[in-house]
């Protein structure tokens, strides 16, 4: 009488995450009276995946008829596949005992689940920096075997170098995991830029899984601040204007000051965009020279995003009060007890 | 559809031989363990002998040595030869079909009457 | 030899009643207890193997459980039908034996 074999086919089957897995396995003979079983893993710990004989395995299913005397063939099905079904399974046959007895176990077929990595989150730094600092954006995305894959930053479509990557765990599991951190160097022109970290993966038929990120989350275009006379006007009122511009993102307090006492306070809100992104802002005060004996300083004090504020000062020249028009006068860090008339801002 | 049909069951002295025989259908028999189950009237089952897919042949104590299980594939029929009845082997014979893998009866033939009584 | 012991021997119950027979083995079967009904003058029919396990066709009215030496069968709601004589048997080395019956009556 032949020796009883158990013979499982494949040394390794791959099947991608969600779908169905046949493990095949077939025994040379039917005797001795006794089940077969599957298990995933070898030795005292492994798994029961399934039993003929008994219990209740909802995923597993036989793929031929097990109650058909000359059916041989005990390959089952495993539905719905994840990543935790990964590993080493194994078809055994028993003698009908008390307990039964294991006489032969097949050589084992290796399952490797192929999952898709989840799509990935980029994160950005938790607060703002200016330009020409460097920030960094981390990338990260779960999930995925085999533990092969590939990622790539951008910036504006343009392919980034200073990053350090990590695939976690080092050593073999069900599923890993990506995390990816590129440090990206700002500038003023930023504010419409995008990174975008993509990963690739034998999953995903060459159709890359891209995650992104703006830039105009990261950063802060600090104002540039201009106060100017605008004109001298026959009634003897001086318009001064406070330009604030190519500024980001638009969180922005502009405070006059008259000799150093709040005169009015505006706060930046649904102003035009620059081309760049950035944004602009005027506020202007009239003065009225022939109310005032001694010079007037007048400051523009801006503060932007939380920042400290930056001012500018301006010194109306009382003394010299001209009554024609004058042209724009630049502003000064001198000035006297003046107090405004009219205030506005555009 | 699955069937087992026993015959040659009657009334036979003590001493005598009698050859019950089963006919299956709708199966192969050699693919299966046979089995025979007696029951004497107002009593329980009572296993008596199996043949299994290989030859190998069992038997329950009290017939050991006088009755003989084998069958006959091209017929697809098992037989029962019973030799030295006693009063005692008087029951409904049945012939049974053992399960795929762990030989649970699973097809019951209708039975067939033994009588030993002189 | 294994020996079956069922209990009780007979049992008088009622339409839509549970009734719960049990079987005890002499010794460890692990799970190979089946289950069969006689009805006077018919051959047994199989219910139950692997001590829980239906045979086709089998309502599921029909329950089984143990494993080792003690096991027991249930049927939830009776039907008239259901009356009938029970046996147990373990088949896990020769020589089989069954248990001596359960006799469930109409009360």
């Known amino acids: 009488e032949e020796e009883l074999q158990v013979i499982q086919p494949e040394k390794s089957v791959s099947v991608a995450a969600g779908d169905s897995a046949t493990l095949n396995c077939t025994v040379s003979s039917l005797i001795p009276v006794g089940p077969i079983q599957w298990f995933r893993g070898a030795g005292p710990g492994r798994e029961l995946i399934y039993n003929l004989k008994e219990g209740h395995f909802p995923r597993v299913t036989p793929v031929s008829d097990p109650t058909k005397r000359n059916n041989m063939d005990f390959s089952i099905r495993i539905s719905n596949i994840t990543p935790a079904d990964a590993g080493t399974y194994y078809c055994v046959k028993f003698r009908k005992g008390s307990p039964d007895v294991e006489l032969k176990s097949g050589a084992g077929t290796e399952l490797s689940v192929r999952a898709k990595p989840s799509a990935p989150v980029v994160s950005g730094p938790a607060v703002r920096a200016t330009a020409e600092h460097t920030v960094s954006f981390t990338c990260e995305s779960h999930g995925f075997s085999p533990r092969d894959i590939t990622l790539k930053w951008f910036k504006n479509g343009n392919e980034l170098s200073d990053f350090q990557t990590n695939v976690d765990p080092a050593g073999k599991s069900v599923s890993y995991s990506i995390r990816s951190t590129a440090r990206v160097v700002l500038t003023r022109r930023d504010v419409h830029s995008q990174v975008i970290c993509e990963v690739a993966h034998v999953t995903l038929q060459g159709d890359p899984l891209r995650g992104t990120a703006n830039l105009s989350e990261a950063i802060r275009v600090p104002p540039f601040l201009e106060v100017t006379q605008q004109s001298m006007r026959a009634d003897n009122q001086v318009n001064v204007t406070c330009q604030v511009t190519k500024f980001y993102p638009q969180r922005l307090q502009l405070t006059w000051l008259e000799n150093g006492n709040v005169s009015r306070t505006e706060m930046a809100s649904a102003l035009p965009e620059n081309k760049d992104g950035t944004y602009n802002w005027t506020s202007w005060l009239l003065v009225n020279v022939s109310a005032h004996r001694d010079d007037v300083k007048l400051t523009c004090q801006v503060e932007h995003d939380g920042q400290p504020a930056v001012n500018k000062s301006f010194s109306v020249k009382v003394s010299a009060h001209p009554k024609e028009q004058g042209s724009n006068t630049a502003a000064e860090n001198t000035g006297t007890n003046e107090r405004n008339i009219y205030g506005g801002s555009g | 559809e699955v069937q087992l049909v026993e015959s040659g069951g009657g009334l036979v002295q003590p001493g005598g031989s009698l050859r019950l025989s089963c006919a299956a259908s709708?199966?192969?028999?050699?693919?299966?363990?046979m089995h025979w189950v007696r029951q004497a009237t107002g009593k329980g089952l009572e296993w008596v002998s199996a043949i299994g897919t290989a030859g190998d042949t069992y038997y329950t104590g009290s017939v050991k040595g006088r009755f003989t299980i084998s069958r006959e594939n091209a017929k697809n029929s098992l037989y029962l030869q019973m030799n030295s009845l006693r009063a005692s082997d008087t029951a409904v014979y049945y012939c049974?079909?053992?399960?795929?893998?762990?030989?649970?009866?699973?097809?019951w033939g209708q039975g067939t009457m033994v009588t030993v009584s002189s | 030899d294994i020996q079956m012991t069922q209990s009780p021997s007979s049992l008088s119950a009622s339409v839509g009643d549970r009734v719960t027979i049990t079987c005890r083995a002499s010794q460890d079967i692990n799970n190979y207890l089946a289950w069969f009904q006689q009805k006077p003058g018919k051959a047994p029919k199989s219910l139950i193997y692997t001590a829980s396990s239906l045979h086709s066709g089998v309502p599921s009215k029909f329950s089984g459980s143990g494993s080792g030496t003690d096991f027991t069968l249930t049927i939830s709601s009776l039907q008239p039908e259901d009356f009938a004589t029970y046996y147990c048997?373990?088949?896990?080395?020769?020589?089989?034996?069954f248990g001596q019956g359960t006799k469930l009556e109409i009360k």
């Open positions: 049974v079909r053992g399960g795929v893998w762990d030989d649970a009866f699973d097809i």
């Open positions: 048997q373990q088949y896990v080395s020769y020589p089989y034996t």
């Open positions: 709708g199966f192969t028999l050699s693919s299966y363990d």
